[in-house]
Interface confidence: medium
């Protein structure tokens, strides 16, 4: 988790002088509770936005937006803590909006936004906005949280972001798998425009199960430049086992930008359909 490398993060708007600061996610008001605390944020919205760094790289970011409730507690609102928790790693990153002037009611509802948390493809986050100061231990909570799922690199807009392109998202191998006689599969795919090796991993499963009954790995050496974008054909030998009939073919490239962690593409061959057995015709017709 990190912040987009923007020049200066701003949270000021007409009628409010505000600065964005790094936060330890442990605001001072936890340790020194205040008697009067503001109410919670209203209408917290999280959306996927895209932003360029100063170097021109494009990253997915969490666009966080919320409004204030129209009650007198805004007189005690000193700022907000924004927290993003990546759910699979428990990594957390926080920033703090520090209000340098007192808020006053005006004719429009106060609205705040922040779009500088960089998020990763295919990850889920919990976004929390805490109004500051935080409540006393038994006080009403004054935060709002929402979960936010970032699409993977198959998503059209995500595909062209720097992290997705670095993991090989622009490569479309267009895998075809053909079943041959004598327990073999012919796998065909399009090579990318990089002189790097690939590996094909074949995993076979019984008809209705997810425990593999066979695995095979085939290495494809780095193509020469004249072979870029050409089709590569490989014949794989299957295990001669009647029930081991559903095959997943996975192609893993080793592009220089992602090495062992490039996006893998896969295709599946289902077990052959069992012909429906016709109902037996009885020798006699019952009379009732």
């Amino acid at each position: 988790l990190r912040l987009l490398d923007h020049r200066a993060l701003v949270c000021s708007q007409p009628g409010l002088n505000c600065t964005v600061k790094n936060s330890t996610c442990l605001d001072d008001s936890w340790i020194h509770p205040r008697n009067l605390t503001p109410s919670s944020p209203k209408d917290l919205q999280i959306q996927l936005h895209f932003a360029h760094t100063q170097q021109g790289d494009l990253f997915p970011v969490a666009h966080i937006e919320w409004t204030l409730q129209t009650d007198a507690s805004i007189l005690y609102l000193e700022g907000a803590e924004l927290s993003v928790l990546q759910l699979n790693t428990n990594e957390r990153l926080c920033v703090r909006f520090e209000f340098l002037s007192k808020l006053r009611h005006h004719h429009r509802r106060w609205r705040f936004t922040f779009s500088h948390f960089v998020v990763d493809p295919d990850q889920e986050y919990e976004v929390t906005v805490h109004h500051l100061p935080k409540p006393i231990p038994d006080g009403d909570p004054n935060h709002q949280s929402k979960n936010f799922l970032v699409p993977d690199c198959e998503h059209a807009r995500m595909k062209v972001t720097t992290p997705c392109m670095s993991s090989g998202s622009l490569w479309d191998p267009n895998i075809t798998v053909e079943t041959l006689e004598a327990h073999q599969l012919r796998v065909s795919f399009t090579l990318w425009n990089e002189s790097t090796h690939y590996q094909i991993l074949l995993t076979s499963f019984p008809h209705m199960e997810n425990h593999s009954c066979f695995e095979h790995m085939h290495h494809i050496p780095a193509p020469r430049p004249e072979e870029f974008h050409q089709r590569s054909n490989v014949t794989l030998t299957l295990r001669n086992l009647k029930g081991c009939c559903r095959h997943q073919v996975q192609i893993q490239p080793f592009f220089s930008s992602c090495l062992n962690d490039c996006l893998r593409h896969s295709a599946t061959v289902s077990c052959p359909e069992m012909p429906d057995t016709p109902e037996p015709i009885p020798d006699y017709m019952p009379l009732w």
């Epitope: 590996q199 991993l201 593999s212 066979f214 695995e215 790995m217 030998t237 295990r239 893993q252 062992n260």
Partner: nanobody, 115 residues
Framework: EVQLVESGGGLVQAGGSLKLSCAAS????????MAWYRQAPGKQRDFVAT???????NYADSVKGRFTISRDNTENTMYLQMNSLKPEDTAVYYC?????????WGQGTQVTVSS
């Protein structure tokens, strides 16, 4: 999760032989394809050879005819017999299960071929 421990490396003269072993723990070994990789100083980790549970093998062009990969499913062990070694075979050799390729690697075993 599979744990892999490589052994058998050492210093050998050009033209000599070594046999590497890879001991695997974890129930996924028996049906899994296994592979050897190597990483020379300052270079990317490269594929060497692979073997599936039926004994089907596949080799990098640079080692074909000189290296032989084998496995013992009952002992959960894979081997790499390296003959006619050349100085360019000097590297740290690693074993892995291709389906776990992006996970943590073992320590590897150092093979040094002197001329």
């Amino acid at each position: 999760e599979v744990q892999l421990v490589e052994s058998g490396g050492g210093l050998v003269q050009a033209g000599g032989s070594l046999k590497l072993s890879c001991a695997a723990s974890g129930s996924t070994f028996r049906g899994a394809a296994m592979a050897w990789y190597r990483q020379a100083p300052g270079k990317q980790r490269d594929f060497v050879a692979t073997i599936d549970s039926l004994g089907n093998t596949n080799y990098a062009d640079s080692v074909k005819g000189r290296f032989t990969i084998s496995r013992d499913n009952t002992e959960n062990t894979m081997y790499l017999q390296m003959n006619s070694l050349k100085p360019e075979d000097t590297a740290v050799y690693y074993c892995n299960v291709p389906r776990f390729i992006s996970r943590a690697w073992g320590q590897g075993t150092q093979v040094t071929v002197s001329s």
